[in-house]
Interface confidence: low
């Protein structure tokens, strides 16, 4: 039976040529984590493989760097980066957790960057 | 648990360098991972650079060129040198793992 659930960043927005942190975290499972997928819509952007580490697709690996931790940080955002974004835990025995992030980039300055994230 | 502690933080004039060093400790599923952040007063925390397994990095723009980033595999350490400091890079500075952060070591550039 899958007993975690997926806390996302939600949706968010931030500004053209700017960067913003994707971020997701698995909760409520003693599952394994074995891989974690990020795609957008249907391209594959990175792969984070508990054996083989990182591998970032090789059509974003100037704009797309790993971290923090399991999230994801887009930079040099355009307009064309608005759209869905999907963390995909792979996890044993559970199976698979999706969680959506929707990221809207502005042209205006006093676009809210919406992933903060507080020191522990 | 991981811990990870921060080290190397200090005054320096502008136009000076800075080694940052960065300890962890503990399991982490990160795929050898190790990043840099860092977060001015009134500001939000912002991506510096990363460090894979394998000697992959990555930088933000306003440090490309000035700051190097490595990784010591065998003591699970990371590394930030920071040349041509400039008062604008006055931040605690922040490591990164699986999802852990350690406190933070304070950099100020100022003459």
């Known amino acids: 039976m899958m007993t975690g659930t997926i806390e996302t960043t939600g949706n968010i927005s931030a500004e053209k040529g700017g960067s913003i942190i994707l971020q997701c975290h698995l909760s409520s499972t003693t599952a394994q984590v074995t891989q974690v997928n990020w795609e957008q819509q249907d391209q594959l952007l990175a792969i984070c493989n508990a054996d083989l580490g990182w591998h970032i697709s090789p059509s974003f690996k100037d704009r797309v760097a790993p971290g923090p931790g399991l999230g994801l940080t887009l930079q040099s955002l355009t307009v064309n980066d608005t759209g869905e974004y999907f963390c995909i835990y792979h996890t044993y025995p559970d199976g698979t957790y999706t969680g959506r992030i929707f990221l809207e980039v502005l042209e205006s300055s006093v676009a809210e960057h919406g992933a903060r994230f507080q020191i522990p | 648990e991981v811990q990870l502690v921060e080290s190397g933080g200090g005054l320096v004039q502008p136009g000076g360098s800075l080694r940052l060093s960065c300890a962890a400790s503990?399991?982490?599923?990160?795929?050898?991972?190790m990043g840099w952040f860092r977060q001015a007063p009134g500001k939000e925390r912002e991506w510096v650079a990363s460090?894979?397994?394998?000697?992959?990095?990555w930088y933000a723009d306003s440090v490309k060129g000035r700051f190097t980033i490595s990784a010591d595999n065998s003591k699970n350490t990371a590394y930030l040198q920071m040349n041509s400091l400039k008062p604008e890079d006055t931040a605690v500075y922040y490591c990164?793992?699986?999802?852990?952060w350690g406190q933070g070591t304070l950099v100020t550039v100022s003459s």
């Open positions: 990164d793992a699986a999802d852990y």
């Open positions: 503990g399991n982490t599923f990160s795929g050898g991972f």
């Open positions: 460090v894979l397994r394998g000697g992959y990095t």
